[in-house]
Amino acid sequence: MAVTACQGLGFVVSLIGIAGIIAATCMDQWSTQDLYNNPVTAVFNYQGLWRSCVRESSGFTECRGYFTLLGLPAMLQAVRALMIVGIVLGAIGLLVSIFALKCIRIGSMEDSAKANMTLTSGIMFIVSGLCAIAGVSVFANMLVTNFWMSTANMYTGMGGMVQTVQTRYTFGAALFVGWVAGGLTLIGGVMMCIACRGLAPEETNYKAVSYHASGHSVAYKPGGFKASTGFGSNTKNKKIYDGGARTEDEVQSYPSKHDYV
């Protein structure tokens, strides 16, 4: 029962994590303009992995996609790759783990097969979570580096007369979503791996031993139960869960009341 719960919980946690990784990857707010002493700004810039946006105090938001591959920084490409790999591995992991779930019966699938699938999905979730955390962390590091570089030369100009204020960027909401989602996927993967240990049948069978009860000539043969798991391959003694399978670019937007500047 504990194994089923651990496996089920691992699946749910990973599912939430992967949904979060997808959300973070699609979000536009990976980096947002640093407002430092100025909470109200006439022009607010924010950037994602796929496009950059500008929200004006008038309420208009304009987003422009990065319509180039070669012109983009290598770090951004690396972050994109990590996030996509994380999503793909997570999606495959979810698919595998659905079939591995103890509560879902598919034909006459052996527990050993389910254990292997659970382990596989667990490893996939762990790698997926690590990819997301790595991607977000690389982007965050890039932001920190750029932040201090732009702070060092905050004002540049000719003879101090004409000033150009450099836009500094800080952590956007997507980074926090990505970190949390990556962590959840990682935890879910670990839970799946733990559940796999409980599912996996141990190889050593106890030999049939005769026990003679005094005054009786009855021999008890345990019948080759697998040790310590409670889920041996002896179908005569094993409870079968047969409740049936249970399926558990330029874009411009007009201001809306939810666009706050």
Partner: antibody, heavy 115, light 113 residues
């Protein structure tokens, strides 16, 4: 079609107060108050987000002027306190548009500060 | 605060003339996020409210005649009227729309020669 109609202007004594209103019809996300002293240029006074009520002011008006809005009446206000002779001007409300320009303006209301 | 300086303060021209008004800002109005300059131009006639002509330094507001055009980037901007019409005699203002507080130039009065 957006329409802006100001009211509330008039003669007031130095140190006195006055509240200007701007009736807004049509969609507006954010609004501005701009003033123009007789024979002088345009001077931006304040801005407000019509949904959150978040304001911002030009330095000269912080503490003396308060921009606000009434959602139910779809009205913009400018509360002016501690008025001085140099506050004598025509006050306009204007809707913020793309590029942070101001595309619709009211007809203006004259405020005269004199003893 | 960003200071806006317009020149000339007034000019005399005839109908059909090409008129150029310049506006200089103390700070760049170019936004790195969308590579647009947040400078706006207005026209005001005596006793009337200002009228929006150009935003983003060069984008014509709908309904504004094509003889009006805007150009410039960074700190230097220009409003050009290719062929002055009788209804164009008015005062023109540039405005910083990039950062609060919004600031206007002192105005350029276009008069009949």
């Amino acid at each position: 079609e957006v329409q802006l109609v100001e009211s509330g202007g008039g003669l007031v004594q130095p140190g006195g107060s006055l509240r200007l209103s701007c009736a807004v019809s049509g969609y507006t996300f954010s609004m501005n108050w701009v003033r123009q002293a007789p024979g002088k240029g345009l001077e931006w006074v304040a801005w407000i987000n019509m949904y959150t009520g978040e304001p911002t002011y030009a330095d000269d008006f912080k503490g003396r002027f308060t921009i606000s809005r009434d959602d139910s009446k779809n009205t913009l206000y400018l509360q002016m306190n501690s008025l001085r002779a140099e506050d004598t001007a025509v006050y306009y409300c204007a809707r913020a548009s793309r590029g942070n320009g101001m595309d619709y303006w009211g007809q203006g209301t004259l405020v005269t500060v004199s003893s | 605060d960003i200071q806006m300086t317009q020149s000339p303060s007034s000019l005399s021209a005839s109908v059909g003339d090409r008129v150029t008004i310049t506006c200089k800002s103390s700070q760049s109005l170019l936004n790195s996020g969308n590579q647009k300059s947040y400078l706006t131009w207005y026209q005001q006639k005596p006793g009337k409210a200002p009228k929006l002509l150009i935003y983003w330094a060069s984008t014509l507001e709908s309904g504004v005649p094509s003889r009006f055009s805007g150009s410039g980037s960074g700190t230097d901007y220009t409003l050009t009227i290719s062929s002055l019409q009788p209804e164009d005699f008015a005062t023109y203002y540039c405005q910083n729309a990039y950062s609060f507080p919004f600031t206007f130039g002192q105005g350029t009065k276009v008069e009949i020669k």
